[in-house]
């Protein structure tokens, strides 16, 4: 008998504790975020990038915030942030302006507590895009691990914005909290 | 539809300068080369060079470098080119263009006459 | 700078006839697998129109008895069966490399 309640007790408790660790995983800071096409800056020098969706296609957000163009942390912890970024172009769609190239994404924190701005990550690389080459095609994917405090902002940088891959699957970039600072 | 509107013919005198100028309608004007070229009176095309008006990117064929200037406002969607210095051998016919979706030139203003005479 | 040069400079072709221009380049004007060499086709008092691109593309609204072939250094521009309103001067050009050249020019004259 005595036995069976301890089993039973056990079931619970085993059970309060799964729904304990769902719920702390559902609050769970994470951001994934895509491309906005209809609002990619033309030229070639760089600039933020300050349009992405978050919550159509792929792109999803949760316990994380995103205002004007950056993604805003809600909890500390430690982050795993990715990038990726893809650069294409074809003669359909008009000349490039020079042939030599440099295709570079650049991830920053910005700290509003004690106004400064880090690079955390960058990446990418000076290419020759033929005039004579009717498609191109170059992807940049970053990825870090970072102790990120609450308020702090993470904004993406491009250089020859023109050229980025509109596609959900091409140009994102994202976050995920992997646990607490201790 | 693309249209490359030319301006009217030039009167000029030696040595003087004509500032020609070429209007673009139906693209985007900054995201291609607009090419100029020459034609003197029954012979046959040469080209000068061309203008990426986006950060105003120019290409001259050797023989022009010193005789034309190309500039644009991307404002006006205009490309310009100004023919310095001027002789008889400068009179000709200028057409401004444009390449095709793919390649080759597709669209062609209609020229501008340019006459120099003493 | 790559040298076009076109022949014969002048050709008479009686109607229904075929015609058949050459451009010979200085040099190769094929890169990433493409030939860039063009046909123009000039009218007096008008400005060229663009009938060939990419060596054998014709272009659109351009009637099927034109064609083109050939690459790297040896093009040809084709006239099926010419008729009367195919009188007039035709271009080669290359854009394959800077600067872009154009050929001396072929006058057609109908018989």
């Known amino acids: 008998g005595s036995q069976h309640i301890r089993a039973e007790k056990a079931m619970v408790d085993g059970s309060w504790l799964d729904l304990a660790k769902r719920s702390k995983l559902e609050a769970q800071p994470f951001a994934h975020l895509t491309i906005n096409a209809t609002d990619i800056p033309s030229g070639s020098h760089k600039v933020s990038l300050s349009s992405w969706y978050h919550d159509r296609g792929w792109a999803k957000i949760s316990n994380m915030t995103f205002s004007n163009g950056k993604l805003i942390v809600n909890q500390d912890g430690f982050y795993y942030l990715y990038a990726n970024i893809c650069f294409r172009h074809h003669e359909t769609s008009g000349d490039l302006a020079t042939e030599y190239l440099q295709l570079m994404v650049y991830v920053t924190k910005t700290s509003i507590k004690i106004p400064s701005s880090h690079t955390l990550m960058k990446g990418g690389s000076t290419k020759y895009w033929s005039g004579n080459s009717e498609f191109h095609f170059y992807s940049i994917n970053v990825g870090g691990f970072f102790k990120l405090r609450s308020g702090e902002e993470i904004s993406i940088e491009v250089s020859n914005p023109s050229l980025l891959d509109p596609d959900q699957d091409a140009t994102y970039f994202g976050a995920f909290k992997v646990r607490d600072i201790d | 539809q693309v249209q490359l509107q030319q301006s009217g013919a030039e009167l000029a005198s030696p040595g003087a300068s004509v500032k020609l100028s070429c209007k673009a309608s139906?693209?985007?004007?900054?995201?291609?080369?607009l090419q100029w070229v020459k034609q003197r009176p029954g012979q046959g095309l040469e080209w000068i060079g061309a203008?990426?008006?986006?950060?105003?990117?120019?290409k001259y064929t050797q023989k022009f470098k010193d005789k034309a200037t190309l500039t644009a406002d991307k404002s006006a969607s205009t490309a310009y080119m100004q023919l310095n210095s001027l002789t008889s051998e400068d009179s000709a016919v200028y057409y401004c263009?444009?390449?095709?979706?793919?390649?080759?030139?597709?669209?062609w203003g209609q020229g501008t006459l340019v006459t120099v005479s003493a | 700078n790559i040298v076009l040069t076109q022949s014969p400079a002048s050709l008479s072709v009686s109607l229904g006839q075929r015609a058949t221009i050459s451009c010979r380049a200085s040099?190769?004007?094929?890169?990433?697998?493409?030939?860039?060499m063009h046909w123009y086709q000039q009218k007096p008092g008008q400005a060229p129109k663009l009938l060939i691109y990419?060596?054998?593309n014709l272009e659109s609204g351009v009637p099927s008895r034109f064609s083109g072939s050939g690459s790297r250094t040896d093009f040809t521009l084709t006239i099926s069966a010419v008729e009367a309103e195919d009188a007039a001067t035709y271009y080669c050009?290359?854009?394959?490399?800077?600067?872009?050249?154009f050929g001396g020019g072929t006058k057609l004259e109908i018989k």
């Open positions: 990419l060596a054998s």
């Open positions: 263009a444009r390449r095709g979706s793919r390649r080759g030139i597709a669209y």
């Open positions: 040099e190769s004007v094929d890169s990433y697998g493409r030939s860039f």
């Open positions: 139906g693209y985007t004007f900054t995201t291609y080369w």
């Open positions: 203008i990426y008006p986006g950060p105003g990117n120019t």
């Open positions: 050009q290359q854009d394959n490399e800077d600067p872009y050249t």
